[in-house]
């Protein structure tokens, strides 16, 4: 059977939404009203990996696009990117590790930890209109907590 994928949107803990910024970058900013239609809809796939009640391995693709969030080393630093894939082969149950995030939910906080780089998290800046990135610190200035809104396919 193919991997199960569900559509969702994400907002950071300051209620910033995620939108496309150019072809291969996401940025976070506050949206209201009709502007909410700009927000990215993810296709979240439940993939193979170590799982617990609080931690579920997922891949985050962009709905109806052959783009996935992935974590790679750039200049020796773990980096978040949007990677183009062959739509005939993705999504799949056994995703390469760079595409896998541990969706961790504890006490109303939802984090996305890179499976490739433990303790590195999908992050946003406090400032408006800044890129979504992979951050190596929790509880600092940068935001690593999100809420998730599932949407009908």
């Amino acid at each position: 059977a193919p991997v199960r994928s569900l559509n969702c949107t994400l907002r950071d803990s300051q209620q910033k939404s995620l939108v496309m910024s150019g072809p291969y970058e996401l940025k976070a900013l506050h949206l209201q009203g009709q502007d909410m239609e700009q927000q990215v809809v993810f296709s979240m796939s439940f993939v193979q990996g170590e799982e617990s009640n609080d931690k579920i391995p997922v891949a985050l693709g962009l709905k109806e696009k052959n783009l996935y969030l992935s974590c790679v080393l750039k200049d020796d630093k773990p980096t978040l990117q949007l990677e183009s894939v062959d739509p005939k082969n993705y999504p799949k149950k056994k995703m390469e590790k760079r595409f896998v995030f541990n969706k961790i939910e504890i006490n109303n906080k939802l984090e996305f930890e890179s499976a490739q780089f433990p303790n590195w998290y999908i992050s946003t800046s406090q400032a408006e209109n800044m890129p979504v990135f992979l951050g190596g610190t929790k509880g600092g200035q940068d935001i690593t907590d999100f809420t998730m809104q599932f949407v009908s396919s």
Epitope: F46, D145, T147
Partner: antibody, heavy 119, light 107 residues
């Protein structure tokens, strides 16, 4: 005993609001995703709201999106459904159920609380 | 949305009979299917999930199977306490939807 007990149902006029509660006991509430499922008189079942175990994830079908809000208080083992701008078609028995988006099915149900929307 | 169509909508059978209820999905749901039993005036009860896995405490006379997009609930030997309405529900894509129900009566 493992159980869910709903309360808060009643008769309400169209356009008004109602808040349902569901009290959980006999299991570790904070470890489970929860949902509300409704059943109109003589009809089938419709899933109307979901919240993840910590409260960070939600889902609403188009029929109630923007009108219903699900929430939970894990310290009090309680699930809520705030229903605003109620319509006649929201008349139903509302069940609290354990389960949701990830697991996909509902393995424990409450007895239901009836909501009637009528002028 | 994926539509779930149950058949028959109602049926009568005798104690000891083998009973089958079918649920047809409007698209492929890859065994992400659940069956519930709802006795009159009560809450639904989980019977089967993942198309064929029996829920805890459910008698072994209940079983689930599938062929393509058709899913079947079978009661091998009908008992008086099985009088109920049976619902299927898929959980492949959102929204997860239920069938319209099959009302089972004893003749």
């Amino acid at each position: 005993e493992v159980q869910l007990v709903e309360s808060g149902g009643g008769v309400v006029q169209p356009g008004r609001s109602l808040r349902l509660s569901c009290s959980a006991s006999g299991f570790i509430f904070s470890r489970y995703d929860m949902s509300w499922v409704r059943q109109a008189p003589g009809k089938g079942l419709e899933w109307v709201a979901y919240i993840s175990h910590g409260g960070a994830g939600t889902y609403y079908p188009d029929s109630v999106k923007g009108r219903f809000t699900i929430s939970r208080d894990n310290s009090k083992n309680t699930l809520f459904l705030q229903m605003d701008s109620l319509r006649a078609e929201d008349t139903a028995v509302y069940f609290c159920a354990r389960g949701g988006v990830y697991k996909g099915y509902f393995d424990l149900w409450g007895q239901g609380t009836p909501v009637t929307v009528s002028s | 949305d994926i539509q779930m169509t149950q058949s028959p909508s109602s049926l009568s059978a005798s104690v000891g009979d083998r009973v089958t209820i079918t649920c047809r999905a409007s698209g492929n749901i890859y065994h992400y299917l659940t069956w519930y039993q709802q006795t009159p005036g009560k809450a639904p009860k989980l019977l089967i999930y993942n198309a064929k896995t029996l829920a805890s405490g459910v008698p072994s006379r209940f079983s689930g199977s599938s062929s393509g997009t058709d899913y079947t609930l079978t009661i091998s030997s009908l008992q008086p306490e099985d009088i109920a309405t049976y619902y299927c529900q898929h959980f492949w894509k959102l929204p997860y939807t239920f069938g319209q129900g099959t009302k089972l009566q004893i003749t």
